[in-house]
């Protein structure tokens, strides 16, 4: 889980070691700043949980880019 | 293809305590979140707990809480699940199940099940 | 947690009919971004671990015959055998995957009449 140290600067210093299916994925934030130890991203899950991940790996890139066709497209 | 082989069938006093192995083959466990079901004679499927990355840790439905132990051995890709203070309504055939190569909360694969016979 | 419930209990059918299973969820299992409602069926026949038939409520999985069909969405959902045949003789069962702990109903057991 992410940890807020000091708000609103929020921080993850472990990754979820499992591949989530994209579709219990609602949304994600990428985590750049100076003050965290690495960079990362926060998936939110579709009953709000958040998972920190690692920006490194495929699945993770996979989900994102997934998430991004997703809001792209408009609902009929 | 996912394969899971489970440890064979337990006659368990009340009391006690019973340890169900389930051996991965085809992925690494790591790739899965392995769960456990267990059925009791003629009665329906009940969801047990398993490994859940929203969480982080494994999580044990609630009336199991404090009971139930489910570990896992990365280096044999095997999973297991001890249950303790066995009562005669633990009598069960016990499966191990996991997701479709990502952690989803439904199951494609199962193992064989073990039969676990709770008896004084 | 999220109770499933399943209707009928029993239910005996003629072969080539068409038996449908209720399930009826406590709270809806659909979300509204993915338009995905979060509900899987499986068939378990005797002394066998059971099967995965649909999940997403209407997704066939892979191999499983095209005469198996489910429909429905948020709270009511239904599987549907378009002609029954001796093979389909097993207990089926829903389970939601929307939020844990997952959940089952209590099955429904189909056999020929």
């Known amino acids: 889980q992410p940890d807020a140290i000091n708000a609103p600067v929020t921080c993850c210093y472990n990754f979820t070691n499992r591949k989530i299916s994209v579709q219990r994925l609602a949304s994600y934030r990428r985590i750049t700043s100076s003050k965290c130890p690495k960079e990362a991203v926060i998936f939110k899950t579709i009953v709000a949980k958040e998972i920190c991940a690692d920006p490194k790996q495929k699945w993770v890139q996979d989900s994102m880019d997934h998430l991004d066709k997703q809001t792209q497209t408009p609902k009929t | 293809q996912v394969q899971l082989v489970q440890s064979g069938a337990e006659v368990k006093k009340p009391g006690a305590s019973v340890k169900v192995s389930c051996k991965v083959s085809?992925?690494?466990?790591?790739?899965?979140?392995m769960h456990w079901v267990r059925q009791a004679p003629g009665k329906g499927l009940e969801w047990m707990g398993g490994?859940?990355?929203?969480?982080?840790?494994?999580i044990n439905a609630q009336k199991f809480q404090g009971r139930v132990t489910m570990t896992e051995d990365t280096s044999t890709d095997t999973g297991y699940m001890e249950l303790s203070s066995l009562r005669s309504e633990d009598t069960a055939v016990y499966y191990c199940?996991?997701?479709?190569?990502?952690?989803?909360?439904?199951?494609?694969?199962w193992g064989q099940g073990t039969l676990v016979t709770v008896s004084s | 947690d999220i109770v499933m419930t399943q209707s009928p209990d029993f239910l005996a059918v003629s072969l080539g009919e068409r038996p449908t299973i209720n399930c009826k969820s406590s709270?809806?299992?659909?979300?509204?971004?993915?338009?995905?409602?979060?509900l899987v069926w499986y068939q378990q026949k005797p002394g066998q671990p059971p099967k995965l038939l649909l999940y997403?409520?209407?997704t066939r999985e892979s191999g499983v015959p095209d005469r198996f069909s489910g429909s429905g969405s948020g709270t009511d959902f239904t599987l549907t055998i378009s002609s029954l045949q001796a093979e389909d003789v097993a207990v089926y069962y829903c389970?939601?995957?929307?939020?844990?702990?997952?959940?089952f109903g209590q099955g429904t057991k189909v056999e020929i009449k």
């Open positions: 199940a996991t997701d479709p190569g990502g952690y989803s909360g439904y199951f494609d694969h």
């Open positions: 490994f859940d990355p929203e969480d982080g840790e494994t």
């Open positions: 709270q809806s299992v659909f979300y509204s971004s993915n338009n995905k409602n979060y």
């Open positions: 085809g992925y690494t466990l790591t790739e899965l979140s």
């Open positions: 389970q939601q995957y929307y939020s844990s702990p997952w959940t």
């Open positions: 997403w409520a209407s």
